[in-house]
Interface confidence: medium
Amino acid sequence: PEPPTACREKQYLINSQCCSLCQPGQKLVSDCTEFTETECLPCGESEFLDTWNRETHCHQHKYCDPNLGLRVQQKGTSETDTICTCEEGWHCTSEACESCVLHRSCSPGFGVKQIATGVSDTICEPCPVGFFSNVSSAFEKCHPWTSCETKDLVVQQAGTNKTDVVCGPQDRLRA
């Protein structure tokens, strides 16, 4: 028969012959021959291969360096890599999450629009008129000014984006 020019899924062409690929979690030891099957071996500890493959070496699991603020989110297996994430209060500096930085705090006059996650930083927004923030925080939103009227009080000092209004008693007309 004619030697194949293409092979089925999960096979590869070598020496004019279709050999089975090694399954995820295993590496290639020797190609198949006319008389023998492809020889595969399981990846060692701390190694993985996540596809049907003909690799002669497994990949090393990622190291989530705790000294860079990283921690293991999910341990690797022979078929999957370790997934790293950042410790609480930190977020990844890149998509690959190779190191972490502390979450940014929103300064007074700014509130948190979106709380940081393990992969994204805090998003701050300026406090609009009628709202204020008097703290530097990675969690606090802008707070609305106190409504003096609902407390039967009047505004004694106007609020800013950093301070609340100051309420005081209404002046009574003396007889």
Epitope: E45, Y63, D65, P66, N67, G69, R71, K75
Partner: antibody
Framework: EVQLVESGGGLVQPGGSLRLSCAAS????????MSWVRQAPGKGLEWVST????????YYADSVKGRFTISRDNSKNTLYLQMNSLRAEDTAVYYC??????????????WGQGTTVTVSS | SYELTQPPSVSVSPGQTASITCSGD??????AAWYQQKPGQSPVLVIY???RRPSGIPERFSGSNSGNTATLTISGTQAMDEADYYC?????????FGGGTKLTVL
């Protein structure tokens, strides 16, 4: 041969200060995080502090935070522990340990012989 | 703060299997290491990354870690294995040690 040699221990009065050193040899010192671990007489191991490879990241046990400072000089292959405001409960053998890094993941693969710190009046 | 709990002591006859446990909240999600310490000596790493053995550590030492418990197993225990054993893990950028287990070979 990979080796860690601690020095600087001794007898000090409560409230006093001491600086421990750890001389490293046999490996690329600047490529590894380093730690100090102590052991009080007859007690278990207690982690004290860790410093990352470049020295920019430092971590401390709550019991020493604000009193102890870990540092390193990669040009001298030396790790330090500056201990201030010492208390009787700081009395222990202090070990310097190398983090395993990408070879011995999440562990300390080399330990020094230890140096004894005694805090007493 | 994170805590690791070990039994204070474990006894075993020579040639038998010794198991030392270390428990902590969701410890299986972290990587555990084990150290051996003999009287008057520095600790020695015997297991890292849950189950891996550093070069020079005998095959009779093995480890596992799942759920809330990591286990150090010494099969065919020898008199020379008598020592204190400590488990260790990283938690929130701090290193945590268990209280230690004294292994007595009867």
């Amino acid at each position: 041969e990979v080796q860690l040699v601690e020095s600087g221990g001794g007898l000090v009065q409560p409230g006093g200060s001491l600086r421990l050193s750890c001389a490293a040899s046999g490996f690329t010192f600047s490529s590894y995080a380093m730690s100090w671990v102590r052991q009080a007489p007859g007690k278990g191991l207690e982690w004290v502090s860790t410093i990352n490879q470049a020295g920019g990241g430092t971590y401390y046990a709550d019991s020493v935070k604000g009193r102890f400072t870990i540092s390193r000089d990669n040009s001298k292959n030396t790790l330090y522990l500056q201990m201030n405001s010492l208390r009787a409960e700081d009395t222990a053998v202090y070990y310097c340990a190398k983090e395993g890094g990408k070879y011995y993941y999440y562990a300390m693969d080399v330990w020094g012989q230890g140096t004894t710190v005694t805090v007493s009046s | 703060s994170y805590e690791l709990t070990q039994p204070p002591s474990v006894s075993v006859s020579p040639g038998q299997t010794a198991s030392i446990t270390c428990s902590g909240d969701k410890l299986g999600d972290k990587y555990a290491a084990w150290y051996q310490q003999k009287p008057g000596q520095s600790p020695v790493l015997v297991i890292y990354q849950d189950s891996r053995r550093p070069s020079g550590i005998p095959e009779r030492f093995s480890g596992s870690n799942s759920g809330n418990t990591a286990t150090l197993t010494i099969s065919g225990t020898q008199a020379m294995d008598e020592a204190d054993y400590y488990c260790q893990a990283w938690a929130s950028s701090t290193v945590v040690f268990g209280g230690g287990t004294k292994l007595t070979v009867l």
